[in-house]
């Protein structure tokens, strides 16, 4: 999906009012310095591409993030504020349902959510120069 035509300000508002705290709660008990940010993004469409990938695509050591509350809210926000997103995701979801995993919090998942927090921070500050 091409995130270029999303309403970025509405997605930012959604993040600030309904998503960010759930990421913090997921990470509770973890030091903010525990993980280094290794995933970056250069602009808002790129950030959303990376956020979608980290949130919904199972990875080695962390297969379950898609069933977390913050992921559900992300899915809902993208569907509302990115034209055509819901249509493109319907087929992808049918495939995902066949491999729905039980929610398990692993260190790899914590690291992945830490990366997500960094991507969201970057998304919310699009005018900052890339480090």
């Amino acid at each position: 999906y091409d995130f270029t035509n999303c309403d970025f300000e509405k997605i930012k508002a959604a993040y600030l009012s309904t998503i960010s705290k759930d990421l913090i709660t997921y990470m509770s008990g973890t030091k903010s310095t525990e993980f280094n940010n290794t995933v970056s993004c250069s602009n808002r469409p790129h950030c959303l591409t990376e956020i979608q990938s980290l949130t919904f695509n199972p990875t080695a050591g962390c297969a379950s993030l898609a069933k977390e509350m913050f992921a559900m809210k992300t899915k809902a926000a993208l569907a509302i504020w990115c034209p055509g997103y819901s249509e493109t995701q319907i087929n992808a979801t049918q495939a995902m349902k066949k491999r729905r995993k039980r929610k398990v919090t692993t260190n790899k998942c914590l690291e992945q959510v830490s990366q997500l927090q960094g991507l969201w921070r970057r998304f919310n500050r699009p005018l900052l120069k890339q480090q």
């Epitope: 926000a77 509302i80 319907i90």
Partner: antibody
Framework: QVQLVESGGGLVQPGGSLRLSCAAS????????MSWVRQAPGKGLEWVSG???????YYADSVKGRFTISRDNSKNTLYLQMNSLRAEDTAVYYC???????????WGQGTLVTVSS | DIELTQPPSVSVAPGQTARISCGGD??????VYWYQQKPGQAPVLVIY???KRPSGIPERFSGSNSGNTATLTISGTQAEDEADYYC???????????FGGGTKLTVL
């Protein structure tokens, strides 16, 4: 303007079935997570069920296995199929637009379901 | 699912400040929403994301959430504010929406 209109409520005997419908207008229905919330007479609000644009569903434990939520995005319509109805299912059933999965920003006017012999 | 606890009733004199509490385990780690419901009407969202007001909701409505308690505050309460108020959050395991039992606000 944004509107949700429920229909299909009525009197049904215990063990019976009923299908509620909700016609949505004024917004891109196919993009939103939609849900049903009920309110027994003189009681509080109880979330019943919700459904994503892609058909992914969630249910309250009290209705799991008896109620089925569905949607037809081409008709901008939300449904609630209620089977094996019990007296305790008697309530006003509200169709609701659930913003960002976690709260309700638009409510219908409600339709009354009475389960009684 | 988590349980949200509200006082059944709260009374306030016109022009005074009404505070309605909503208690739940580690509630401060989740977002809380508040709805106003008048007799025979559907609920109306008055606070979202702990403390934000939807457009059209008067400034006298405000919200806070920390620890195990969220609070809806109505400053300079008016007769038209008499209604039932429901807090709402969600369960992080089941992902279900959860409502408090409701509080009847009486403006004396």
């Amino acid at each position: 303007q944004v509107q949700l209109v429920e229909s299909g409520g009525g009197l049904v005997q215990p063990g019976g079935s009923l299908r509620l419908s909700c016609a949505a207008s004024g917004f891109t229905f196919s993009s939103y997570y939609m849900s049903w919330v009920r309110q027994a007479p003189g009681k509080g609000l109880e979330w019943v069920s919700g459904i994503f644009f892609d058909g992914e569903t969630y249910y309250a434990d009290s209705v799991k296995g008896r109620f089925t939520i569905s949607r037809d995005n081409s008709k901008n319509t939300l449904y609630l199929q209620m089977n094996s109805l019990r007296a305790e299912d008697t309530a006003v059933y509200y169709c609701a637009r659930q913003q960002y999965f976690d709260h309700i920003d638009i409510w219908g006017q409600g339709t009354l379901v009475t389960v009684s012999s | 699912d988590i349980e949200l606890t509200q006082p059944p009733s709260v009374s306030v004199a016109p022009g005074q400040t009404a505070r309605i509490s909503c208690g739940g385990d580690s509630l401060g780690g989740k977002y809380v929403y508040w709805y106003q419901q008048k007799p025979g009407q559907a609920p109306v969202l008055v606070i979202y994301g702990d403390s934000k007001r939807p457009s059209g909701i008067p400034e006298r409505f405000s919200g806070s959430n920390s620890g195990n308690t969220a609070t809806l505050t109505i400053s300079g309460t008016q007769a038209e504010d008499e209604a039932d108020y429901y807090c709402q959050s969600y369960d992080l395991k089941s992902l279900n929406v959860v409502f408090g039992g409701g509080t009847k606000l009486t403006v004396l």
